[in-house]
């Protein structure tokens, strides 16, 4: 379910110098990029998949979960170089012999087309154009995601216009 965005209106007769509490506002933290209902953070450093997973956790976020092809395309559009790759929150579960998202769900066959081996110690990364599997020990960049959070900002009504 998509979070609702509170509407705001301004009473023109209201004293404009008065500081008012603005209704619910969807905000991404500084340095994070908003992509629809998510905030994404593209790392600058490189790490194995497990370390990338841990880094996202320390930021109160998770490795990127991709719901469908549209979301994949939107994310890939933010990758500005063909030569850069980013870990996402998908790896191969040997016990279940299937690709598994870090939230516990399994990859649907029509969600993403993964190029590469589906085997033990395989994790998934995305590039500007494709989705690949690679040894999880490989050190590369990664993408963390947060759901957009509701924040109450105290603002002057002037800044609403």
């Amino acid at each position: 379910q998509k979070p609702s965005i509170g509407k705001c209106s301004v009473d023109i007769q209201q004293n404009r110098t008065k500081t008012t509490e603005r209704p619910d506002l969807l905000n991404c933290p500084i340095y994070w990029q908003q992509v629809q209902e998510k905030c994404l953070l593209f790392s600058h450093t490189v790490n194995p998949w497990n370390n990338s997973l841990a880094d996202c956790s320390t930021k109160e976020s998770s490795l990127l979960l991709i719901q469908d092809k549209d979301e994949l395309t939107r994310t890939q559009n933010l990758i500005h170089d063909k030569a850069i790759s980013f870990w996402i929150g998908l790896n191969f579960s040997l016990s279940e012999k299937n690709w598994k998202w870090i939230n516990g769900s399994f990859l649907s066959s029509n969600d993403l087309k993964i190029t590469g081996d589906a085997k033990e110690n395989s994790c998934v990364y995305i590039s500007q154009t494709s989705v690949y599997s690679e040894y999880c020990s490989t050190e590369m960049k990664w993408i963390c995601q947060k759901e957009l959070t509701l924040v109450r900002n105290k603002v002057s009504p002037d800044s609403w216009l």
């Epitope: 450093t45 490189v46 030569a83 850069i84 190029t115 990364y125 490989t138 050190e139 590369m140």
Partner: antibody, heavy 122, light 108 residues
């Protein structure tokens, strides 16, 4: 200035050893996969070895496996190649190279040193 | 190991000519291919990566194309500084990262 400078080449007898060094400057060395690539006189390019940014992952070409050891010191911004049991066919210019934008194991080499010549001869 | 075969091994051309060099992989490598230029006594220089992406600072007369097993480097209008040897390189995730045998572009 972004650059790589190799050193340590020279003349060595078959069976001997050499240690090559590569000093990096002008970029965040600790974030990049680094490789050694060699070129025998008048011949083509041959990838020798790579090391991941942390040093945890290392690969070698079959032709040098068991004889060469790649290592790095991120605190010193330096890459090394320890070459043992050298053979005449190891004679080449050895280049230190950086991978393009830390792309995982797809290593496009966007920055190269000028190379250092290793000659193995009796 | 994946083998790369470049053709021709040498080509004679004049300034202003269009030059095409091909590289064939022994098995499919998607778009994981690079092209380098090397001049005598110098280190190689990256021209093209990911089969078709132009490396920063490289003139637009250089272009790359192809996917799978067949790749092409094209110099649309040869300049005096382009006379050199050109190498392709495959960069699939499993080493070794092999290079083609090289193509020497000479002055006609």
């Amino acid at each position: 200035q972004v650059q790589l400078v190799e050193s340590g080449g020279g003349l060595v007898k078959p069976g001997g050893s050499l240690r090559l060094s590569c000093a990096a400057s002008g970029f965040t060395f600790s974030q990049y996969y680094m490789s050694w690539i060699r070129q025998a006189p008048g011949k083509g390019l041959e990838w020798v070895s790579y090391i991941s940014p942390s040093g945890a992952t290392i690969y070698y070409a079959d032709s040098v496996k068991g004889r060469f050891t790649i290592s790095r010191d991120n605190a010193k911004n330096s890459l090394y190649l320890q070459m043992n049991s050298l053979r005449a066919e190891d004679t080449a210019v050895y280049y230190c190279a950086r991978s393009l934008m830390a792309t995982g194991t797809h290593l496009y080499f966007d920055l190269w040193g000028r190379g250092t010549l290793v000659t193995v001869s009796s | 190991d994946i083998q790369l075969t470049q053709s021709p091994s040498s080509v004679s051309a004049s300034v202003g000519d269009r030059v095409t060099i091909t590289c064939r992989a022994s098995q499919g490598i998607s778009s994981w291919l690079a092209w380098y230029q090397q001049k005598p006594g110098k280190a190689p220089k990256l021209l093209i990566y990911a089969a078709s992406a132009l490396q920063s600072g490289v003139p637009s007369r250089f272009s790359g194309s192809g996917s799978g097993t067949d790749f092409t480097l094209t110099i649309s209008s040869l300049q005096p500084e382009d006379f050199a040897t050109y190498y392709c390189q495959q960069v699939t995730s499993a080493p070794p990262y092999t290079f083609g045998g090289g193509t020497k572009v000479e002055i006609k």
